[in-house]
Interface confidence: low
Amino acid sequence: GITIPRNPGCPNSEDKNFPRTVMVNLNIHNRNTNTNPKRSSDYYNRSTSPWNLHRNEDPERYPSVIWEAKCRHLGCINADGNVDYHMNSVPIQQEILVLRREPPHCPNSFRLEKILVSVGCTCVTPIVHHVA
Amino acid sequence: GITIPRNPGCPNSEDKNFPRTVMVNLNIHNRNTNTNPKRSSDYYNRSTSPWNLHRNEDPERYPSVIWEAKCRHLGCINADGNVDYHMNSVPIQQEILVLRREPPHCPNSFRLEKILVSVGCTCVTPIVHHVA
């Protein structure tokens, strides 16, 4: 893979003045064996509010790969397999923690970041807004 | 709040031998202003596969509070407002990163942990298994 050069401005791991800094062991304790959302279930295809999963990759972030859900339809799939626009497919969002390399490209220095990701979609009764 | 005494076995922040350890700045860069899932949307109530949100708290984890979704019904709500058992409400799960104090109660030492949380529910067409 691409080797990103070390940023000369990276703080020393032992810098006590690094603000609100803690030591984090990256040997992840993983309680889950299945990390690919497409394999974990086929709900994205079987749902009445189906979604596609998009790969979002960023080498400056840990985890570098995040899967983002995008609803396939504005409406929901009815019993006949057609899109029913009386209902709405909406993304279910989750706020997650990621580690952002800061300063950029530093191998041993990160900042915690909260990002909002769409995990999947659900079918809801709509609140009707007029398109202005 | 409760002050947890410092564990005398906590590693020193400057310990170079701490395995695969990085510095993490806990001044979170938060792109999202709304952190209460109940306030961010009312999808959990309006969904055809509604869910309840349960507060899961653990002072040894960061974030200490995680909201877990539990589907209200086995089936989905139909147009008449009744539960239709020809469809299934299922949880949408997301693998998230948390920080676990390690050793316990240490203020400056964590291990990354991946946990699976249920974010919300979606309505799916069931896979019918024949009883052999």
Epitope: N56, L74, L116, S118, V131, A132 | -
Partner: antibody, heavy 118, light 110 residues
Framework: EVQLLESGGGLVQPGGSLRLSCAAS????????MSWVRQAPGKGLEWVSA????????YYADSVKGRFTISRDNSKNTLYLQMNSLRAEDTAVYYC???????????WGQGTMVTVSS | NFMLTQPHSVSESPGKTVTISCTRS????????VQWYQQRPGSAPTIVIF?????PSGVPDRFSGSIDSSSNSASLTISRLKTEDEADYYC?????????FGGGTKLTVL
């Protein structure tokens, strides 16, 4: 009522930079993906870039990838487009748009003119 | 990237019906929504059809949209034409990471 007001356009030399802003009002800004679409004089519409409601995901047309950066400040209800290494072919009216869903521009601003010329 | 092809121009008399076509070069049109935008001279575009055939409130029912999967094309039909319908019309669709507009069709109401 949904209102989108673009600003920041003007005349710039090739290779120069410009930052467009789009002030939004009349809706919950952070709940909507936003897009920039441009229109060269006498030509058709061309999608430029889009950003998710949280700002976590961004998308670019191949013609601007690596030169333009879309961003948003949800606390200020403002969308931005940072344009670097500008070329003559970037000359256009730039519209910001509120997306109904990904790829569906429901409401549009009135546009701001960007002219790249020496 | 795929392309969306529209006729350069169409013309029809007031009171008549006109149809503007939009053909997708690759990728199934049925998998992604098609939108139609109207742009009058000197004004910003406005959406007249979204999600293939949905009409925003305020858009007359004279405007309708449809898709034909067999020809991988979409159509905008305007019935009972009025002089105020004279404008440029753009179809638009998308895929996983980009949004594409058709080249535009100039509608002249004779």
């Amino acid at each position: 009522e949904v209102q989108l007001l673009e600003s920041g356009g003007g005349l710039v030399q090739p290779g120069g930079s410009l930052r467009l802003s789009c002030a939004a009002s009349g809706f919950t800004f952070s709940s909507y993906a936003m897009s920039w679409v441009r229109q060269a004089p006498g030509k058709g519409l061309e999608w430029v870039s889009a950003i998710s409601g949280s700002g976590g995901s961004t998308y670019y047309a191949d013609s601007v990838k690596g030169r333009f950066t879309i961003s948003r400040d949800n606390s200020k209800n403002t969308l931005y487009l940072q344009m670097n290494s500008l070329r003559a072919e970037d000359t256009a009216v730039y519209y910001c748009a509120r997306d109904l869903i990904w790829g569906v521009a429901g409401s549009w601003g009135q546009g701001t003119m960007v002219t790249v010329s020496s | 990237n795929f392309m969306l092809t529209q006729p350069h121009s169409v013309s029809e008399s007031p009171g008549k019906t006109v149809t503007i076509s939009c053909t997708r070069s690759s990728g199934s049109l049925a998998n992604y929504y098609v939108q139609w935008y109207q742009q009058r001279p000197g004004s910003a575009p406005t959406i007249v059809i979204f999600a293939n055939n949905q009409r925003p409130s305020g858009v007359p029912d004279r405007f309708s949209g449809s898709i034909d999967s067999s020809s991988n094309s979409a159509s905008l039909t305007i019935s009972r034409l009025k002089t105020e319908d004279e404008a440029d019309y753009y179809c638009q669709s998308y895929d996983d990471s980009s949004v594409v507009f058709g080249g535009g069709t100039k509608l002249t109401v004779l």
